[in-house]
Interface confidence: medium
């Protein structure tokens, strides 16, 4: 089943997010991802936890998962690199770099996204865009076309309240509000984009979606700049 946890969003403008990737297992959408270099897609480490001996591929240039589109192309994965400290039972360090079998053919619908290197928190209240092919309602309906939603960043202190995530949000994580609008199952690994720059990656914990007391959790990419650079080098 798709991993992770867009509710309350709307269909995205087709191909307006050329960095968007669908990480697929045996031909089916599993997780979101974001093209960060010509041959590398960033996603969430937990996404491949259950991949076992399946075929992992990355779909780029897509709006619809099922319909033919000139820009769509499925790439094999040459190499999967989980963050060395990621573990199945925690949300920390939930990052994965996937090296494509070849450099992606770039164009208007396929383009890497600049990612944040300055390790500073995004200001609370900043509206950020999250997109994905994750479930769109609590019944688990999966969309065929890319969805997106704008979410305000939530300050860490609020997110760490006992009624919310009870201290689990480290400095390497960030939160966004989840009041009926939220990332949800199948969005994990996808990008949280603030001001045209990748700031976060949707974590793949089994969090309830759309509940304001359980904000969305995102891995701050700036906190992992050294690791990302070392893998891409």
């Amino acid at each position: 089943p798709p991993r992770g946890r867009i509710l309350g969003g709307r269909e995205a403008e087709a191909h307006a997010r050329p960095y968007m990737a669908s990480v697929q297992l045996n031909g089916a959408h599993l997780c979101g991802g974001v093209l960060v270099a010509e041959q590398w897609v960033l996603s969430a480490a937990h996404c491949l936890e259950d991949a076992a001996d399946g075929k992992v591929q990355v779909l780029l240039g897509a709006h619809s998962l099922s319909q033919p589109e000139p820009s769509k192309r499925l790439y094999d994965v040459l190499r999967a690199v989980p963050h060395p400290d990621s573990q199945p039972d925690t949300i920390d360090h939930d990052l994965l770099l996937l090296q494509l079998s070849e450099k992606a053919t770039l164009g208007p619908a396929v383009r890497p996204l600049p990612w944040q290197r300055v390790d500073r928190d995004v200001a609370p209240g900043t509206l950020c865009d999250v997109a994905g092919w994750g479930i769109v309602n609590h019944a688990g309906r999966r969309p065929d076309s890319l969805q997106h939603v704008l979410l305000p960043v939530l300050d860490r202190a609020t997110c760490n309240r006992r009624t919310h995530h009870d201290g689990a949000i480290t400095e390497r994580l960030m939160c966004a509000e989840s009041n009926r609008r939220d990332s949800c199952k199948g969005d994990s690994g996808g990008p949280l984009v603030c001001g045209g720059v990748l700031e976060g990656v949707v974590t793949s914990g089994s969090r309830v979606c759309g509940n304001r007391k359980k904000p969305g959790i995102y891995t701050r990419v700036a906190s992992y700049a050294a690791w990302i650079d070392s893998v891409l080098a």
Epitope: L48, D50, A52, D53, G54, K55, V56, V81, Q99
Partner: antibody, heavy 120, light 112 residues
Framework: EVQLVESGGGLVQPKGSLKLSCAAS????????MNWVRQAPGKGLEWVAR??????????HYADSVKDRFTISRDDSESMLYLQMNNLKTEDTAMYYC???????????WGTGTTVTVSS | DVLMTQTPLSLPVSLGDQASISCRSS???????????LEWYLQKPGQSPKLLIY???NRFSGVPDRFSGSGSGTDFTLKISRVEAEDLGVYYC?????????FGGGTKLEIK
């Protein structure tokens, strides 16, 4: 609970045959590559064989020491793994472990093992 | 075949000490896909082996952070920062990059 339970071990004469079984439960067996690893009494671990999943055409690989004598197979409908051992030699005497292989190729779940003794 | 050589064969330690186990491969174990499939397993007396570290430095689920793996190419190390009683047993390195896959001969961690 994820579990692997081996059976079929026992005493067999040199040049004889034996078939080991491994019953898997608690996970989607059909999506995993599976292995046999053995350990001779008082010795270290030795990888024996691997069989991949259906999506990888049930591809098999063997250690040189057992090639052409041992055959690994699986029955996904029953969540069973097998090791058919023919032309057994005294050096095949060992504890045989059934082992699951995770996405990053590590051996993440091990059975408790079944003992094979090859002796005249 | 890739020969995996572990040193030392036996490692007597005091509880609380740091322990270091070396594993050297007879050739590079970088897979054609760029990953290095080097793992470490611990086998306690009378038990099946358990996975500690995969792809050189990734700790497996539930493995305490006192265990760390490092290395590249042909030289790899497992470090235990503060040895506890439950860490005693035989440690094996393993390469899964080149078939036939091979284990090291093992290192027995014991109390001094």
């Amino acid at each position: 609970e994820v579990q692997l339970v081996e059976s079929g071990g026992g005493l067999v004469q040199p040049k004889g045959s034996l078939k080991l079984s491994c019953a898997a439960s608690g996970f989607s067996f059909n999506t995993y590559a599976m292995n046999w690893v053995r350990q001779a009494p008082g010795k270290g671990l030795e990888w024996v064989a691997r069989i991949r999943s259906k999506s990888n055409n049930y591809a098999t690989h063997y250690a040189d020491s057992v090639k052409d004598r041992f055959t690994i197979s699986r029955d996904d409908s029953e969540s069973m793994l097998y090791l058919q051992m023919n032309n057994l030699k005294t050096e095949d005497t060992a504890m045989y472990y059934c082992v699951r292989q995770g996405y990053y190729w590590y051996f993440d779940v091990w059975g408790t093992g079944t003992t094979v003794t090859v002796s005249s | 075949d890739v020969l995996m050589t572990q040193t030392p064969l036996s490692l007597p330690v005091s509880l609380g000490d740091q322990a270091s186990i070396s594993c050297r491969s007879s050739q590079s174990i970088v897979h054609s896909n760029g990953n290095t499939y080097l793992e470490w397993y611990l086998q306690k007396p009378g038990q099946s082996p358990k996975l500690l570290i995969y792809t050189v430095s990734n700790r497996f689920s539930g493995v305490p952070d006192r265990f760390s793996g490092s290395g590249s190419g042909t030289d790899f190390t497992l470090k235990i920062s503060r040895v506890e009683a439950e860490d005693l047993g035989v440690y094996y390195c393993f390469q899964g990059s080149h078939v036939p896959w091979t284990f090291g001969g093992g290192t027995k961690l014991e109390i001094k």
